[in-house]
């Protein structure tokens, strides 16, 4: 059974992941981003189901495409390099989903824009955090 300290650690990691995802979204989805129109042409795979930490496998598999799109963003929008940002997210995702069990991600039929993709995973984090508090 999860202890209160492990629950607290999970909560903190999710909060960190949430802030990172929100920071990326804020950097992209604003009217001063000169690359927004181009970025919105890239398609991302969405999870068919995202209700448990193991479903973060679906996020992990899309981190490389996410980094590639972020490389389009001007440095004014991102003071962190995309590689560093994605690396930070990857570390948190790996810790949260655990590496013991192998989970095969199932994707929805419809692809999504980067904004829809980030909003989906932001909602996921908020939802899991609310069950922990």
């Amino acid at each position: 059974a999860p202890t209160s300290s492990s629950t607290k650690k999970t909560q903190l990691q999710l909060e960190h992941l949430l802030l990172d995802l929100q920071m990326i979204l804020n950097g992209i989805n604003n009217y001063k981003n000169p690359k927004l129109t181009r970025m919105l042409t890239f398609k991302f795979y969405m999870p068919k189901k995202a209700t448990e930490l193991k479903h973060l496998q679906c996020l992990e598999e899309e981190l490389k495409p996410l980094e590639e799109v972020l490389n389009l963003a001007q440095s004014k929008n991102f003071h962190l390099r995309p590689r560093d940002l994605i690396s930070n997210i990857n570390v948190i995702v790996l810790e949260l989903k655990g590496s013991e069990t192998t989970f095969m991600c199932e994707y929805a039929d419809e692809t999504a824009t980067i904004v829809e993709f980030l909003n989906r995973w932001i909602t996921f984090c908020q939802s899991i955090i609310s069950t922990l508090t």
Epitope: L19, M23, N26, N30, Y31, L80
Partner: antibody, heavy 122, light 111 residues
Framework: QVQLVESGGGVVQPGRSLRLSCAAS????????MHWVRQAPGKGLEWVTV????????YYADSVKGRFTISRDNSKNTLFLQMNSLRAEDTAVYYC???????????????WGQGTTVTVSS | DIVMTQTPLSSPVTLGQPASISCRSS???????????LSWLHQRPGQPPRLLIY???NRFSGVPDRFSGSGAGTDFTLKISRVEAEDVGVYYC????????FGQGTKVEIK
């Protein structure tokens, strides 16, 4: 002094069109992104659209996308809003507001016009 | 869209007394450039909005120092240290971190 003056409002029937103008003076117009923000009677503020300082990009709220078009003429220091297929829910005071695009201060929408009233009614 | 929620929606105040308005965003307003694009506007009856505070706590030029802004992340506050008669009207918080959205407004009136 710095001034934004809107014009072109009036009473129009649903489905018809209207073109609003915003005349800018007292500052370098081409350095500023320009917004339209509206306020329905007795309601709060709603962002409508923005155009970049050089006119290269424009964005719209979902509620007006495909019906409204923002444009500007930097040689005449004027901003426009072409409103087509007007609906009753577009009834509002329409304000233009400037936002510095090139400076470092990031004031946001620091100067607003007095507004022009658009009434959509049959 | 980012949803901005203001409390209270109405605030009857006594002249010379302090007033405080809260604003909460549905998600963090911090951009990766380190800035938080949260502004406060004041609108008197029949007038256009006027910028008071930008980037959480910076007073715009000509704004009296009785106005101050604070907060971080998703929670923000506008304080008036001593309310004057000219301060009546509606106050809006506004975010431009993403596409602009406004709070519902807080009506400040004299008791």
């Amino acid at each position: 002094q710095v001034q934004l003056v809107e014009s072109g409002g009036g009473v129009v029937q649903p489905g018809r069109s209207l073109r609003l103008s915003c005349a800018a003076s007292g500052f370098t117009f081409s350095n500023y992104g320009m917004h339209w923000v509206r306020q329905a009677p007795g309601k709060g503020l709603e962002w409508v659209t923005v155009i970049w300082n050089d006119g290269s990009n424009e964005y719209y709220a979902d509620s007006v996308k495909g019906r409204f078009t923002i444009s500007r003429d930097n040689s005449k220091n004027t901003l426009f809003l072409q409103m087509n297929s007007l609906r009753a829910e577009d009834t509002a005071v329409y304000y233009c507001a400037r936002e510095d695009w090139l400076g470092e201060a990031d004031y946001g929408m620091d100067v607003w016009g007095q507004g022009t009233t658009v009434t959509v009614s049959s | 869209d980012i949803v901005m929620t203001q409390t209270p929606l109405s605030s009857p105040v006594t002249l010379g007394q302090p007033a405080s308005i809260s604003c909460r965003s549905s998600q963090s307003l911090v951009r990766s450039d380190g800035n938080t694009y949260l502004s406060w506007l004041h609108q008197r009856p029949g007038q256009p909005p006027r910028l008071l505070i930008y980037k959480i706590s910076n007073r715009f030029s000509g704004v009296p120092d009785r106005f101050s802004g604070s907060g971080a992340g998703t929670d923000f506050t506008l304080k008036i240290s001593r309310v004057e008669a000219e301060d009546v009207g509606v106050y809006y918080c506004m975010q431009t971190t993403q596409f602009p959205t406004f709070g519902q407004g807080t009506k400040v009136e004299i008791k």
